[in-house]
């Protein structure tokens, strides 16, 4: 089944929408904004989402838009293209015509260009490391707890394969969650890091992606994990190109 | 094709611990999770806990936290669990399971673990 | 710990017969798995993610449900469907099971 068959809905995106209009009167779901369709049986790519989530009514976010001077990683939000496959292209350009290269997980990797900017390819991000705060707890998790719960919550919500979970660290209060995948590491059907990473982040954020499921409720033996920062790190198989300008 | 084979039938005492192994084939062994689990004469299927074959991270049930332990030898592609202090109400069928995207995939065929004095 | 708690625990039926089978949770999960299980045999998995069937296994079964309420049903029993059928969560640790509902024949 592509789509919860019942009430013709998208488990893993709620910024769909369906319709029993497949073949067979099965239900099909197209992501808003692209009105591409996705497999509501695995994640959504990021490209989609981000582009699902740029054309949602402004009026309909739920949270607050931090000030002009707040910090955001990189770019923050903007408008991606994505391929017939929903990855981001190399190359991405706004309305204006300033144009940049992308990674895999739609992070700038050059300073921005105009129109006859070249990006030959999309380079894999192979290595995410998640770094987390938690807030205060009566004492520190148990390290071997902590890891396995991170670790089974990839597995199950997010359907990311034990082997791109690399590495759990944890001293207290900071956690990191190491995620690499190579493209020869990466099968058909395997989920991406860069998409598990994303759908992450937003749960943390208390924005789930997924439908008619409940926030993320993380417990440790029972303890609520609760996490009041969160930033994330992304290597990219062949190094970005950005001006010594930039790096001063 | 994946196999999981455990080893066999095992009588110990109550007091005793007993080791119960799981050799895994077809498949890349650190890539994978083992899971342990139980089922008593006439019972139903009781989860023991899991072992992250790559890293080592090992997550047990409370009910069997300080009597159980579970490693891996990745040389042989062969997972282990070993219960101590046992008692009667251990008498049970362990079975081990890979894990990867689903909790339990590939099962093993079992192992009888009888506790009698 | 989330319990889990199957109804009914045994049932008769004849071939031929459509069954139900329904797996109540104590909270709410993610997804439903569905095994099967014969005398003196490992389980097998036959349904993951609630609906999806796993390689091998004949389309007369099938699952439903979401939140806490979670049905496995087979639409025209065989022979060879004559076993213990169990539900299972992993939504949270500890994973549990049901306790299993034992499916006779009349």
């Known amino acids: 089944h592509t789509a919860a068959q019942d009430n013709c809905t998208c488990p893993t995106n709620k910024m769909t929408v369906c319709s029993p209009d497949g073949p067979g009167g099965r239900c099909q779901c197209r992501a808003l904004g692209s009105g591409m369709a996705v497999d509501c049986s695995t994640l959504t790519s990021k490209c989609l989402l981000l582009k699902a989530r740029m054309s949602a009514p402004k009026n309909a976010r739920t949270l607050v838009r931090p000030s002009e001077h707040a910090l955001v990683d990189n770019d923050g939000l903007y408008d991606p293209d994505c391929d017939p496959e929903g990855r981001f292209k190399a190359r991405q350009c706004n309305q204006t015509s300033v144009c940049w290269c992308v990674n895999s997980v739609g992070v700038r990797r050059t300073d921005k260009g105009d129109l006859s900017l070249r990006c030959d390819e999309l380079v894999r991000t192979h290595h995410i490391l998640i770094d987390l705060r938690h807030r205060p707890t009566a004492g520190a998790f148990n390290h071997s707890d902590l890891d396995a719960e991170l670790r089974r919550l990839f597995r199950e919500r997010y359907r990311l394969h034990p082997k791109f979970v690399a590495a759990v660290h944890y001293e207290q209060p900071t956690i990191q969650i190491e995620l690499r995948q190579n493209t020869s590491q990466k099968a058909a059907g395997d989920v991406d890091i860069g998409d598990a990473a994303y759908y992450f982040e937003r749960d943390i954020k208390g924005e789930s992606l997924f439908q008619g499921r409940g926030g993320l409720d993380l417990r440790v033996r029972g303890e609520p994990l609760q996490v009041e920062r969160t930033l994330i790190y992304y290597l990219d198989e062949i190094p970005p190109k950005f001006s010594m300008k930039r790096l001063t | 094709e994946v196999q999981l084979v455990q080893s066999g039938p095992e009588v110990k005492k109550p007091g005793a611990s007993v080791k119960v192994s799981c050799k895994a084939s077809g498949f890349t062994f650190t890539d994978y999770v083992i899971g342990w689990v139980r089922q008593a004469p006439g019972q139903g299927l009781e989860w023991i806990g899991e072992i992250y074959l790559g890293s080592g991270t090992i997550y047990y049930t409370q009910k069997f936290k300080g009597r159980v332990t579970m490693t891996a030898d990745t040389s042989t592609s062969t997972a282990y669990m070993e219960l101590s202090s046992l008692r009667s109400e251990d008498t049970a069928v362990y079975y081990c399971?890979?894990?990867?995207?689903?909790?339990?995939?590939?099962w093993g065929q079992g192992t009888l673990v009888t506790v009698s004095s | 710990d989330i319990q889990l708690t199957q109804s009914p625990s045994s049932l008769s039926a004849s071939v031929g017969d459509r069954v139900t089978i329904t797996c109540s949770a104590s909270?709410?999960?993610?997804?439903m798995y569905w095994y099967q299980q014969k005398p003196g045999k490992a389980p097998k998995l036959l349904i993951y993610d609630t609906s999806t069937l796993q390689s091998g296994v004949p389309s007369r079964f099938s699952g439903s449900g979401s939140g806490t309420d979670f049905t496995l049903t087979i639409s025209s029993l065989q022979p060879e469907d004559f076993a213990t059928y169990y539900c299972?969560?992993?939504?949270?640790?500890?994973?549990?099971f049901g306790q299993g509902t034992k499916l006779e024949i009349k």
């Open positions: 909270s709410s999960v993610s997804y």
């Open positions: 399971a890979r894990g990867s995207i689903f909790p339990f995939d590939y």
């Open positions: 299972q969560q992993w939504s949270s640790y500890p994973y549990t």
